[in-house]
């Protein structure tokens, strides 16, 4: 953690990825783009899918890949969870096929952690209308994160992604 420069987060400058619940990122992204301008150009090509409305999570998912969340305390970008990816893929892959294209390899769901936990940090997304949330009664903003287990005080509720994320400064098992 000696290199301050290494952990610096940058404001998200991509309009379609603003107001999604986090506002800073760190390049390179999960596809390897070094510049937000390259990520933005690629992101905007997905407009037809977003407009089609195949999944309410699609925009958040794409943004979490192309401009992943950054925190000053952890040296790696926080992208989407595999579960959100699979949910989006299930809804949007048939539509993409209608457009004549296959699901992109860069969005291969096996590349993302299955779920957000102590070993892998990821964003589980804002919850899809037709897909039940994993909790029988969803945690409301401001509630404590008891569902994550014994170390619930190490987590904080993130409104946009509707799930508990490890607070800055706690070891997520990323370096073990």
């Amino acid at each position: 953690f000696g290199d301050e420069e290494e952990r610096r987060c940058d404001p998200i400058r991509i309009s379609m990825c603003q107001n999604l619940g986090y506002n800073v990122t760190k390049m390179p992204n999960l596809v390897g783009h070094e510049l937000q301008t390259d990520a933005e150009l690629q992101l905007t090509t997905f407009t037809p899918l977003i407009q089609y409305g195949c999944s309410s999570q699609l925009q958040f998912f794409l943004c979490s890949v192309y401009v992943p969340m950054c925190t000053e305390k952890i040296n790696i970008p926080i992208g989407p969870c595999g579960g959100m990816c699979l949910s989006v893929k299930r809804r949007c892959e048939p539509v993409l096929k209608e457009f004549g294209f296959a699901w992109p390899e860069s969005l291969n769901c096996s590349k993302f952690p299955p779920q957000n936990d102590h070993n892998h940090m990821c964003m589980e997304g804002p919850g899809d209308e037709e897909v039940p949330l994993p909790h029988k009664t969803p945690i409301q903003p401001g509630e404590e994160c008891h569902s994550v287990g014994t170390n619930s005080d190490q987590y904080i509720w993130v409104k946009r992604s509707l799930n508990c994320v490890l607070k800055c400064g706690y070891d997520a098992g990323l370096y073990s």
Epitope: H33, D38, T45, P48, E105
Partner: antibody, heavy 118, light 107 residues
Amino acid sequence: EVQLVESGGGLVKPGGSLRLSCAASGFNFGIYSMTWVRQAPGKGLEWISYISGDSGYTNYADSVKGRFTISRDDSKNTLYLQMNSLKTEDTAVYYCARVGPGGWFDPWGQGTLVTVSS
Amino acid sequence: DIQMTQSPSSLSASVGDRVTITCRASQGISSYLAWYQQKPGKAPKLLIYAASNLLGGVPSRFSGSGSGTDFTLTISSLQPEDFATYYCQQTYSTPWTFGQGTKVEIK
């Protein structure tokens, strides 16, 4: 059938202006990103400009930046390329193309020839 | 800018031949690569996208492979209608750039 038809090409003097049009049909034009690509006589392909489906994002190759402007009128299903301060090296066939998710160009229009000469 | 280098620049082949065209990117582009076919006086047509995905309606004798910096377009058994110029293109980083083209001629 998805179709793109360019028009507006012709002979123009160096320093002059021209506006190319690309009429789209057979698909929901308003949600797709679009692009312009050119090909000088006997040469390869050069990408020159891009516009997102909502017109909120545009991008240009350095060779045309500041001189060319891409725009669209979704009510007319038409893409435009306004070309100012034309140079002899802008002589080319200009193609418009639809951009699919991921950045792939499909289909392309038949092209329109722009000749810049004194 | 990312430079795309195709080889060979041209090749002569006979109907039924297996033809391979390579495309090298000056830096990694993941699988953000497309292949286009262009016949004289006509617009280019998309054949393969995302390095290895065949566009619907394109004959299965065409195939693409590669990731990162090295990519290949293969025509397993050349047909008379395949004589054309082929271009690779990267859409990973702006400006989006094309290779210089490979002309496939009749031997």
